[in-house]
């Protein structure tokens, strides 16, 4: 009897371990999205970036959805969100319209239930990119910890999108779930 | 009989709890490495920084290895990687040859199995550090979420290494495991 | 007998799952604190920022305490700490005292047991904010992984606090626990 119970217990505990491990993984959605350089919009004002890779190079996604240029939360939780945005200009690209630039990123959250958009994080700098230098570069990094609900969407807006560095190591954003909501 | 089973179960569950707790800890490698100022290389182009502290001040490492200037992954997983790099110049530091500087960081991943190096993240800025000011400073921060395999190596490259701020709160990089690979 | 044991085991395992889930949540303190713009100090030198929101907008806190302008650790562990600090100036705000600015952030840890303060992370830039431009902006982001003990306090110091951007998406800091101390 006792031996049978022990064996049964071990079996149940084994499956419990699998279940715990599996549920732990499922409890941790993430995404790392890299810029799709073939589809960067023009303009100097605030523009939403809608083209990102989620399945090539460093791009990846799990238990989240990428749709219509937005990263969609599938699971309630507290997430660490981050973005790295690089801007560059070389004199061979032609003259800049202005030497005084506002290079900015805005990480926004949109709720479909209550159609509204809120900026979670912003960063950037005003820059003077003078003609005395043949090359200019600038990067912004932002990150923060936010409560996200299933269905909410994260998107990235930037100024001067035509100056974006199209490399996957330069312009990207992401999220990973850290913990459940109590 | 029933009492005996209860006692035995508590005992087994107790050890399961220990095991779960222990395995959770072991599943979370991390490192925070701070610059070793006594061994900063010279050069103006991209230079690999190989001297970091992992066991003094804020420097620490667990379930990862630091060897030959590289942070070695011992355990497959998804990791959050970050770097903070500070550059500075004071008029007493030396004869700065140019006002136009490219201050950059590159976080690279090297696979030994397939000898190749890839940049995961980059950041920085071109700067104009004029002689009209006696002190100049600039910091870069990058961070992102990456899949790393056991044996892969993370290293840091910078431009203008002689301008690095040698403080442990200024120039550092690190990683921590967030979750397993499915 | 065997059926009764199975039922009992399921019940015990169920509560174990609740306990595990609950203890996991309790093992993950976090905070995201946003600047309280009604109480920003003046000055151009290093100033401690003591007014932050922890319960409105993006501000939130759990299993940590905010008191006297400091974020207090209630639970030993390894934490990821971050800060995003934005500075801005518009010509309508009046003339700057100087065009040469040092815009800096320092994330400090204070131990009450051993009354001492140490800088964990710093970042920033010297800037030339010339009168040729009507608007200036600059953001700093820092982040890193640190061992924190219960009772230790995290605070934020900045230079030129009067130039801080008072938006909750602009100037904030935070922490979340990643793992226990072995």
């Amino acid at each position: 009897g006792s031996q049978h119970i022990r064996a049964e217990k071990a079996m149940v505990d084994g499956s419990w371990l699998d279940l715990a491990k599996r549920s732990k993984l499922e409890a941790q959605p993430f995404a790392h999205l890299t810029i799709n350089a073939t589809d960067i919009p023009s303009g100097s004002h605030k523009v939403s970036l809608s083209s990102w890779y989620h399945d090539r190079g460093w791009g990846k996604i799990s238990n989240m959805t990428f749709s219509n240029g937005k990263l969609i939360v599938n699971q309630d939780g507290f997430y660490y969100l981050y973005a790295n945005i690089c801007f560059r200009h070389h004199e061979t690209s032609g003259d800049l319209a202005t030497e005084y630039l506002q290079l900015m990123v805005y990480v926004t959250k949109t709720s479909i239930k209550i159609p509204s958009s809120h900026t979670l994080m912003k960063g950037g700098s005003t820059k003077y990119w003078s003609g005395n230098s043949e090359f200019h570069f600038y990067s912004i990094n932002v990150g923060g910890f936010f409560k996200l609900r299933s269905g909410e969407e994260i998107s990235i807006e930037v100024s001067n999108p035509s100056l974006l560095d199209p490399d996957q190591d330069a312009t990207y954003f992401g999220a990973f779930k850290v913990r459940d909501i109590d | 009989g029933s009492q005996h089973i209860r006692a035995e179960k508590a005992m087994v569950d107790g050890s399961w709890l220990d095991l779960a707790k222990r395995s959770k800890l072991e599943a979370q490698p991390f490192a925070h490495l701070t610059i070793n100022a006594t061994d900063i290389p010279s050069g103006s182009h991209k230079v690999s920084l190989s001297s970091w502290y992992h066991d003094r001040g804020w420097g620490k490492i667990s379930n990862m290895t630091f060897s030959n200037g590289k942070l070695i992954v011992n355990q497959d997983g998804f990791y959050y990687l970050y770097a903070n790099i500070c550059f500075r110049h004071h008029e007493t530091s030396g004869d700065l040859a140019t006002e136009y500087l490219q201050l950059m960081v590159y976080v690279t991943k090297t696979s030994i199995k397939i000898p190749s190096s890839h940049t995961l993240m980059k950041g920085g800025s071109t700067k104009y550090w004029s002689g009209n000011s006696e002190f100049h400073f600039y910091s870069i921060n990058v961070g992102g979420f990456f899949k790393l395999r056991s044996g892969e190596e993370i290293s840091i490259e910078v431009s203008n290494p002689s301008l690095l701020d040698p403080d442990q709160d200024a120039t550092y990089f690190g990683a921590f495991k967030v979750r397993d690979i499915d | 007998g065997s059926q009764h044991i199975r039922a009992e085991k399921a019940m015990v395992d169920g509560s174990w799952l609740d306990l595990a889930k609950r203890s996991k949540l309790e093992a993950q303190p976090f905070a995201h604190l946003t600047i309280n713009a009604t109480d920003i100090p003046s000055g151009s030198h290093k100033v401690s920022l003591s007014s932050w929101y922890h319960d409105r907008g993006w501000g939130k806190i759990s299993n940590m305490t905010f008191s006297n302008g400091k974020l207090i650790v209630n639970q030993d562990g390894f934490y990821y700490l971050y800060a995003n600090i934005c500075f801005r100036h518009h010509e309508t705000s009046g003339d700057l005292a100087t065009e040469y600015l040092q815009l800096m952030v320092y994330v400090t840890k204070t131990s009450i047991k051993i009354p001492s303060s140490h800088t964990l992370m710093k970042g920033g830039s010297t800037k030339y904010w010339s009168g040729n431009s009507e608007f200036h902006f600059y953001s700093i982001n820092v982040g890193g992984f640190f061992k924190l003990r219960s009772g230790e306090e995290i605070s934020i110091e900045v230079s030129n606090p009067s130039l801080l951007d008072p938006d909750q998406d602009a100037t904030y800091f935070g922490a979340f626990k990643v793992r226990d101390i072995d």
């Epitope: - | 030396g94 004869d95 140019t98 006002e99 004029s130 002689g131 | -």
Partner: antibody
């Protein structure tokens, strides 16, 4: 062809002044720090001044500090050395030299002019 | 200021000989040493920088080594066109200082 051509040398009395010029061609002058290096007759080389690529940093050894002033005009691809309160020991061939790219704090010289002779004598 | 002491001040060698010149710095300069060649009546030419890196177009018979305070410049096989005075320079800290020179002649 990368070239540096010095001019302005000559004979001057002690206490007098002289302005040397160096015309640069064949490279993007504004990208390089520049220096003046002199060589007294039958002696070795002595660095006498340096200027950053943008012209906002100037450097001198103690032997000439306060007497010599280095400057540049990037629009004209030109480097200058204004020498005041000249002494007999300033007699030398003065070379204009381009600092090679390298560590921002380290100066060595990859392109040199042919030199111009300065003689300080009463 | 960092003093650079070069030796010998002059030497005579045959074509094909291995020629070695040494330079000693008065303090540690890591590997921040350059070597120049100056022919009579001409401007100096950069041969080596950062102790051991040959400048573009410099023949492979010229090499440099050393770190800290002791440095060596070598011509592996002396050629007639190598007749010149050779100078070391520290590029570690300002003011930039040169050695006294080594005059190389053919026997």
């Amino acid at each position: 062809e990368v070239q540096l051509v010095e001019s302005g040398g000559g004979l001057v009395k002690p206490g007098g002044s002289l302005r040397l010029s160096c015309a640069a061609s064949g490279f993007t002058f504004r990208n390089y720090a520049m220096s003046w290096v002199r060589q007294a007759p039958g002696k070795g080389l002595e660095w006498v001044s340096g200027i950053s690529s943008g012209g906002t940093y100037t450097y001198y050894p103690d032997t000439v500090k306060g007497r010599f002033t280095i400057s540049r005009d990037n629009a004209k691809n030109s480097l200058y050395l204004q020498m005041n309160s000249l002494r007999a020991e300033d007699t030398a061939v003065y070379y204009c030299a381009r600092r090679d790219y390298g560590d921002v704090y380290e100066w060595y010289f990859d392109v040199w002019g042919k030199g111009t002779t300065v003689t300080v004598s009463s | 200021d960092i003093q650079m002491t070069q030796s010998p001040s002059s030497l005579s060698a045959s074509v094909g000989d291995r020629v070695t010149i040494t330079c000693k710095a008065s303090q540690d300069v890591r590997t921040s040493i350059a070597w120049y060649q100056q022919k009579p009546g001409k401007a100096p030419k950069l041969l080596i920088y950062s102790a051991s890196y040959r400048y573009t177009g410099v023949p492979s018979r010229f090499s440099g080594s050393g770190s800290g305070t002791d440095f060596t410049f070598t011509i592996s096989s002396l050629q007639p066109e190598d007749i010149a005075t050779y100078y070391c320079q520290q590029h570690y800290s300002s003011p930039w200082t040169f050695g006294g020179g080594t005059k190389v002649e053919i026997k």
